[in-house]
């Protein structure tokens, strides 16, 4: 059983990378002297208590920054937020912390990240770029939900 987070880099199909700006993740075109975030991810250890065939349930954080991605409702709208949280603290909890979990599905080189707390809502970036990461139900329209995840070993 892997009980340390794996590290990875993410870009979307338009070759935009994730950058941390004022405690918000945004997707921007890769440029010189830019510091894309390194993702930390770890599978939930209570996988048997979650839905099967939806993907691998993972906690997603920013490597070395004690920040994790989570989903919460603002009004009636599920939103993507960054919270100060140790990813291993989430991993070790006695139950899945669903607000911080995502079903990671891979199809070829493409990865999607579906909220466990809000099924049908996916991490996305606006096709325009330079915008914050969001959650969307609208697949393949104005938002990009397919990402390339490259593991760093």
């Amino acid at each position: 059983k892997i009980d340390t987070p794996q590290r990875g880099s993410i870009q979307d199909i338009n070759h935009r990378v994730w950058v941390l700006q004022d405690q918000t993740l945004i997707a921007v075109p890769r440029k010189d002297r830019m510091s894309p975030v390194t993702i930390a991810l770890i599978s939930c250890r209570h996988v048997e208590t979650l839905e099967k065939d939806r993907g691998n349930p993972i906690y997603l954080g920013l490597n070395g920054l004690n920040l994790c991605l989570m989903c919460a409702k603002v009004g009636d709208q599920p939103t993507l937020q960054l919270k100060e949280k140790d990813i291993m603290d989430l991993y070790n909890q006695p139950e899945p912390v669903k607000s911080f979990l995502f079903y990671h599905s891979q199809s070829g080189r493409n990865s999607t990240f579906e909220s466990v707390a809000f099924p049908g809502w996916f991490i996305a970036v606006s096709s325009e770029g330079g915008c914050p990461l969001i959650l969307t139900q609208e697949l393949g329209k104005a938002n990009t939900t397919d990402f390339g995840l490259t593991m760093l070993f």
Partner: antibody, heavy 121, light 109 residues
């Protein structure tokens, strides 16, 4: 206001089955885990198991595997505990409780007032 | 299966500090046991106090605190009040299941 309303007392015969209910108000059971706990007279608490009402997955204490069945109906915001092949050992008060994550940990934050089950011929 | 042991009864006075403990038959209690503490008052009135060893549940008075003392989980009430008279149960996680202790009857005289 968050409340867990449990069904009324039951008197049942040995060998029978019973289904106890726990109806939540003030929150959606799909957003949390629902736990069931047994308390016998002059004894401590025993964890029976839990259900994730959003997807129906369950966990049981090994002692209650086969004895207890946990289900939930999200449309009525209700969790259920079914006990089968009842014996006098099942005479107890049964509680439902919400086990919720807030900030940095899981807590038993709200409890029902219990359902008294008496098994007697 | 693990057995969780608590003091059967303790007595304290208003304003005093009292510590209740929770021992595991499998060895030292650690943060991996995610100790929970629950209060039971008459007429089946339960309230969750502590989760994850030392995290107070929302709305719980600051006089209640959880910790590890030696090889046990502990609940400390700093400045006990008469309304704290109750039975206190601890519960410890062992992998995928939860085990409750027998409870401590706290009297505040």
């Amino acid at each position: 206001e968050v409340q867990l309303q449990q069904s009324g007392a039951e008197l049942v015969k040995p060998g029978a089955s019973v289904k106890l209910s726990c109806t939540a108000s003030g929150f959606n059971i799909k957003d949390t885990y629902m736990y069931w706990v047994k308390q016998r007279p002059e004894q401590g608490l025993e964890w029976i198991g839990r259900i994730d009402p959003a997807i129906g997955t369950t966990r049981y204490d090994p002692k209650f595997q086969g004895k207890a069945t946990l289900t939930a109906d999200t449309s009525s915001n209700t969790a259920f505990l079914q006990l089968s092949s009842l014996t006098s050992e099942d005479t107890a008060v049964y509680y439902c409780a919400r086990y919720d994550y807030s900030g940095s940990s899981f807590y038993f934050d709200y409890w029902g007032r219990g359902t008294t089950l008496t098994v007697s011929s | 299966q693990a057995v969780v042991t608590q003091e059967s009864a303790l007595t304290t006075s208003p304003g005093e500090t009292v510590t209740l403990t929770c021992r595991s038959s499998t060895g030292a209690v650690t943060t991996s046991n995610y100790a929970n503490w629950v209060q039971e008052k008459p007429d089946h009135l339960f309230t969750g106090l502590i989760g994850g060893t030392n995290n107070r549940a929302p709305g719980v008075p600051a006089r209640f605190s959880g910790s590890l003392i030696g090889d046990k989980a502990a609940l400390t009430i700093t400045g006990a009040q008469t309304e704290d008279e109750a039975i206190y149960f601890c519960a410890l996680w062992y992998s995928n299941h939860l085990v409750f202790g027998g409870g401590t009857k706290l009297t505040v005289l």
